[in-house]
């Protein structure tokens, strides 16, 4: 069961896996959740008797999922969120005052303030956390010095009380890094650099995901099952280098190499290994053996067994045992199989319990039918219809769900809108006719318009709606991923514009959500078509040379959604254009990637 509550002055006895240092109990709980085996923890607060144990976070495991409770002053105990259904994030924007988080200092430089120091850490490949000496620090020579730090585990090796310094963590896991995101996997390539760890993996994609959530892995080499040396088959070597890039590439068949997706992990699944591996057996410590009907049932069983990390399903040989087989639930110290065997007929895979550690926007949506302009239920689950109720209720604009309390839309939608009270947001809608008096909607608490917005044509045509209540995600109502800063060089080829807007310039709002596949254009190309306008880097253009497919009145604020590596990204917001679907007049969209900092600043504000 899911226990969120923390137990003050309680120590969980026994079950110790390892001890790390965290600035508070809440952070200790997150560290426990992301650790492959931790189910419970005890954190030693400053009020504990032994000052040498302050800030220690003791990660624990138990076969019974519980441990004896002992009274102890200053101890705070609790359970990991592994048992909980809600989405998780490793993002920690807190700044810890008067704490020196210790690790390996590898860079010391002067910065204006702690925020700049945190940015420096976020944009440095090696940095896990930082300590900044404020301008009130007693040692004058050390004032304003920003120390970037890393450790083998990503957590501090110690924490000291120290007045007039502040510490904090890298915001890479908050999607705030400017570092490049290199998604290519290079076949027949070995990176010859420092191995920091090695794990067993079934393929290069799982190897890459493991590299992504390893604190120090910057790139990897994976040896496939065809690799000549048997002891290296299915071996995933996690690597780093001082420069952050591989120093040497060696051409070797049956090896694949690639990079950590740390800098784009919010828009790509890195914890969720959902595939099945056929004719493959995963070896590890056996947790349980159960009879089930099929490998999918075996995966479900592993997902519901809290300590299960991976499984192998073996179908029964007896013909009378139709469809039944044996499900071997397994675990290991690092969450990966200890060995992988092929040719034995097993079907293996991983628990799906870790999928909630990925951004919900990365989960696959229902397969779509290509062609046709009317959308299908659940095809664009991030699309919302924004209504105004004054003077009468009508569709005003489109919008996109980007968080459980946030809609991203266009600023120009709010011309003449005096108050958020007259707005209603409807999610999970296909036909406008579904909206009746009693249809559930979200009230709008706040309209946040970019403060540089003047007109759609001059740019900054972007706005956020903060909902009055949080949204529960369903198959027909869930978020779209924002693009990654690190993805700025990606060429999107599968882009769609959606909305209930006019189908021609003089028309009316459509009942059914319409969709159109539209190619993106370069800004140079676009400038040629709009010579009397300034097409800025904050805009992106899409459309056919011959016209015919475009967004139109009523589509404003809606998404330009592009699919890349099986994940949909909100690349643009429908903004403006000359006419609709005119020849040589592409549609102009707000270029979302250029406004990521603004979006994150507004949505992650305390």
């Amino acid at each position: 069961e899911c226990v969120i509550k923390l137990f003050s002055d309680i120590y969980f006895q026994g079950g110790d896996i390892t001890t790390v240092y965290t600035p508070n109990a809440k952070h200790c709980q997150v560290v426990c959740t992301y650790h492959p085996r931790c189910l419970l923890f005890t954190f030693m607060a400053e009020s504990s008797v032994d000052s040498t144990k302050w800030f220690s976070c003791i990660l624990k495991d138990s076969v019974t999922e519980s441990l004896p409770k002992v009274n102890m002053t200053g101890a705070i105990s609790g359970y990991s969120f592994k048992q909980c259904p809600h989405q998780l994030s490793a993002c920690n924007k807190d700044i810890y005052v008067d704490l020196d988080m210790q690790g390996m200092n590898y860079n010391g430089s002067v910065t204006k303030n702690a925020q700049e120091c945190q940015e420096r850490c976020t944009n440095d490949a090696h940095c896990h956390f930082f300590t900044y000496a404020t301008r009130q620090f007693p040692s004058a020579e050390h004032r304003n010095i920003c120390l970037l730090k890393y450790t083998q585990t990503g957590a501090p090796t110690g924490i000291r009380k120290l007045k007039k310094v502040v510490s904090g963590f890298s915001l890479k896991s908050c999607a705030l890094s400017n570092l490049a995101c290199i998604r290519d996997i290079f076949p027949s390539t070995v990176f010859a650099d420092n191995n920091i760890d090695s794990v067993v993996a079934p393929d290069a994609l799982v190897c890459r995901r493991i590299c992504t959530h390893h604190p120090n892995c910057l790139f990897f080499t994976f040896f496939s099952q065809e690799w000549p040396k048997e002891s290296h088959r299915n071996l995933c070597l996690l690597k780093t280098s001082e420069s952050g890039l591989p120093s040497t590439r060696i051409h070797k068949n049956q090896a694949l190499s690639g990079f950590s997706l740390q800098n784009c992990r919010h828009s790509i699944p890195v914890f969720c290994h959902s595939s099945f591996y056929y004719d493959t057996d995963f070896l590890g410590e056996e947790l349980d053996i159960v009879d089930v009907k099929g490998h999918e049932a075996c995966q479900k069983m592993c997902t519901s067994a809290i300590r299960c990390q991976f499984f192998t399903y073996s179908s029964s040989q007896e013909s009378h045992n139709k469809g039944k087989g044996t499900c071997y639930l397994k675990l290991s110290s690092n969450g990966s199989p200890t060995k992988i065997l092929h040719g034995r007929g097993g079907i293996s895979g991983y628990t799906l319990r870790l999928c909630k550690m990925d951004n919900v926007c990365t989960t696959k949506i229902k397969p779509r039918i290509v062609g046709g302009s009317a959308s299908l239920p659940g095809e664009w689950p991030w699309q919302v219809t924004l209504h105004t109720v004054s003077p009468t209720q009508r569709h005003l604009c489109g919008g996109s769900i980007i968080g459980n309390q946030w809609i991203l839309t266009a600023a120009h939608c709010f011309y003449g809108i005096e108050s958020p009270k007259i707005l209603r947001v409807y999610g999970g809608i296909l036909n406008q006719s579904e909206i009746k008096e009693d249809t559930a909607f979200f009230g709008v608490q706040e309209i946040i318009i970019h403060d540089q917005y003047k007109t759609a044509e001059s740019g900054y045509d972007i706005a956020l709606l903060k909902l009055e209540t949080t949204m529960n995600y369903t198959d027909s109502q869930r978020p779209i991923c924002l693009p990654s800063k690190g993805d700025r060089n990606v060429i999107y080829t599968d882009c769609w514009v959606t909305g209930w807007g006019y189908r021609k310039l003089r028309d009316k709002i459509q009942n059914t959500l319409q969709k159109a596949k539209i190619p993106l254009l370069s800004n140079e190309e676009c400038r040629k078509r709009y010579q009397r306008h300034e097409i800025t880097s904050g805009m992106i253009c899409a459309g056919y040379k011959e016209g015919g497919k475009d967004a139109c009145k009523g589509d404003s604020g809606g998404p330009l959604s592009c699919k890349h590596n099986e994940v949909w990204h909100l690349v643009g917001i429908t903004s403006w254009g000359e006419g609709c679907a005119q020849r040589e007049r592409p549609g102009i969209y707000t270029n979302v990637v250029k406004y990521l900092d603004w979006i994150l600043e507004k949505t992650q504000a305390p």
């Epitope: 390996m104 590898y106 430089s109 000496a133 007693p138 040692s139 020579e141 050390h142 970037l148 730090k149």
Partner: antibody
Framework: QVQLEESGPGLVAPSQSLSITCTVS????????IYWVRQPPGKGLEWLGM???????DYNSALKSRLSISKDNSKSQVFLKMNSLQTDDTARYYC??????????WGQGTTLTVSS | DIVMTQSHKFMSTSVGDRVSITCKAS??????VAWYQQKPGQSPKLLIY???YRNTGVPDRFTGSGSGTDFTFTISSVQAEDLAVYYC?????????FGGGTKLERL
């Protein structure tokens, strides 16, 4: 673990130059300042100078004209050079790591004798 | 440059005594003062930094106090292994400087 080790010539003639190397392990010179401190026989500690993580240097005012501190981050080595040595430069020379101006780790020191 | 003065070159004490060593700075050094212990034939060892912060592994009988120009280092109950030379050092502004040292000896 953190270690610092000084190595020097041991004996130098007056008016000659001195070069001492401090080799460190367990941490990176790009993230820590390194100090040089000396101690004449039976006397107290004297602060000579330091090199910061970013390569900036600071020196003892009285010795500034004779001192030079440099480093090689890739080799994890810090160098102390001192010229025009006199007999009163005879001392044990230590390198130490910076922790906000204090010195949290010290080498064992190397003894220098200035004598003809 | 800042001069640090330890007025007592020697201090006599017995096991179990409370002893305080003082150090005076020639100008305001805020709270940027460290204290070191040095035993014969050994390198100095950091005990206290920034006036009152104990270094890792230093017993809590060692404490420091003061600010501005006047600083005190105290051993609440002297142990035999505490007999050594103690140095103060300002780490407020470079060039950093040490006091002359105070030798703690058996009475």
């Amino acid at each position: 673990q953190v270690q610092l080790e000084e190595s020097g010539p041991g004996l130098v003639a007056p008016s000659q130059s001195l070069s001492i190397t401090c080799t460190v392990s367990g941490f990176s010179l790009t993230g820590y300042g390194i100090y040089w401190v000396r101690q004449p026989p039976g006397k107290g500690l004297e602060w000579l100078g330091m090199i910061w993580g970013d390569g900036r240097t600071d020196y003892n005012s009285a010795l500034k004209s004779r001192l030079s501190i440099s480093k090689d981050n890739s080799k994890s080595q810090v160098f102390l050079k001192m010229n025009s040595l006199q007999t009163d430069d005879t001392a044990r020379y230590y390198c130490a790591r910076d922790y906000y101006g204090s010195k949290d780790y010290w080498g064992q020191g190397t003894t220098l004798t200035v004598s003809s | 440059d800042i001069v640090m003065t330890q007025s007592h070159k020697f201090m006599s004490t017995s096991v179990g005594d409370r002893v305080s060593i003082t150090c005076k700075a020639s100008q305001d050094v805020s709270t940027a003062v460290a204290w070191y212990q040095q035993k014969p034939g050994q390198s100095p060892k950091l005990l206290i930094y920034l006036t009152s912060y104990r270094n890792t592994g230093v017993p809590d009988r060692f404490t420091g106090s003061g600010s501005g120009t006047d600083f005190t280092f105290t051993i609440s109950s002297v142990q035999a292994e505490d007999l050594a030379v103690y140095y103060c050092q300002q780490h407020y502004k470079t060039p950093y400087s040490f006091g002359g040292g105070t030798k703690l000896e058996r009475l």
